[in-house]
Amino acid sequence: RKIPKVGHTFFQKPESCPPVPGGSMKLDIGIINENQRVSMSRNIESRSTSPWNYTVTWDPNRYPSEVVQAQCRNLGCINAQGKEDISMNSVPIQQETLVVRRKHQGCSVSFQLEKVLVTVGCTCVTPVIHHVQ
Amino acid sequence: GITIPRNPGCPNSEDKNFPRTVMVNLNIHNRNTNTNPKRSSDYYNRSTSPWNLHRNEDPERYPSVIWEAKCRHLGCINADGNVDYHMNSVPIQQEILVLRREPPHCPNSFRLEKILVSVGCTCVTPIVHHVA
């Protein structure tokens, strides 16, 4: 999947655009908003009716090297009595993000953009029930 | 991808850090995943904390379209299909990396940008405090 060119007619390619070899693009990995602190709701993962745990995956050849993945703790959902209700389902909610992958080929290194699917949390859903004949 | 020769010390000296600027292949690696969450699942309608999806479009960003979730209710849907306000619908937020055209409007020059998106909603049982 290629990154689309700027297709809008009102865009003029500025003179200041850096020269880039064909088939590639220049990427500055100094992240915009890197230090922006977000106030996430405190421990929603354990107060949710579809609670989840977090696992950190680490890969030195990926940027960022740390990616956090969520896993639903239960198949069912937690009811008002604190018990698991298996008539409901805990399901993962996923979001795509971009990472930069470093590849080594002999004494050379190349970089590739990669889409990664991250599980960010879980939600409780009413299952669709089919009765099989 | 685009290969960059390593420094003369190769293979002994391995640079652990990523360089500040890299040349990357225009092709993005990974299964052509479905970027429209409405098509990929109907959890947003079946959840006890349902949400609506709003399209956020920005031609200076890749991906140019990002879907933002907004919880439909303050409370959660109970077994009778009514909103139970003793529970909370809470957005699940995630920081993601996108590409920002830099300088603006340049077709093949980007910078990584971190943005916060609401991906969906979950139902939460709040701890209750009575204020004296």
């Epitope: 106030s39 709701s41 405190r42 421990n43 | 303050l74 909370n88 809470v90 701890i127 405090h129």
Partner: nanobody
Framework: EVQLVESGGGLVQPGDSLRLSCAAS????????FGWFRQTPGKEREFVAG????????EYANSVKGRFTISRDNSKNTVDLQMDSLRPEDTAVYYC?????????WGQGTLVTVSS
């Protein structure tokens, strides 16, 4: 710790209006929503109205829709409930609620009596 100060309760006649106010102070950051419940003797507390902090989305109980209006002032961490066309069945103790997603704070309540 979070403090909630409710005001505006009192005795009014049917058809009259009343405005309830609630001010939050202390560590009231990351607000999810702010609103009001009410309770009459021997009954459970019922939701009246709520306003989401992030986008001012409002929700009302069916029994008050079209008569009550909830509004907020972000800069002051306050929420107001404008109650119009009051009915005898609106008589209750009204509780301010501050919701921080995983923690919820209840005020002490203010009495509203609608009687001729």
């Amino acid at each position: 710790e979070v403090q909630l100060v409710e005001s505006g309760g009192g005795l009014v006649q049917p058809g009259d209006s009343l405005r309830l106010s609630c001010a939050a102070s202390g560590r009231a950051n990351s607000i999810n929503w702010f609103g009001w419940f009410r309770q009459t003797p021997g009954k459970e507390r019922e939701f009246v109205a709520g306003i989401r902090w992030s986008d001012a989305y409002t929700e009302y109980a069916n029994s008050v829709k079209g008569r009550f209006t909830i509004s907020r002032d972000n800069s002051k961490n306050t929420v107001d409930l404008q109650m119009d066309s009051l009915r005898p069945e609106d008589t209750a103790v009204y509780y301010c609620v501050l919701d921080l997603s995983t923690v919820r704070y209840w005020g002490q309540g203010t009495l509203v009596t609608v009687s001729s």
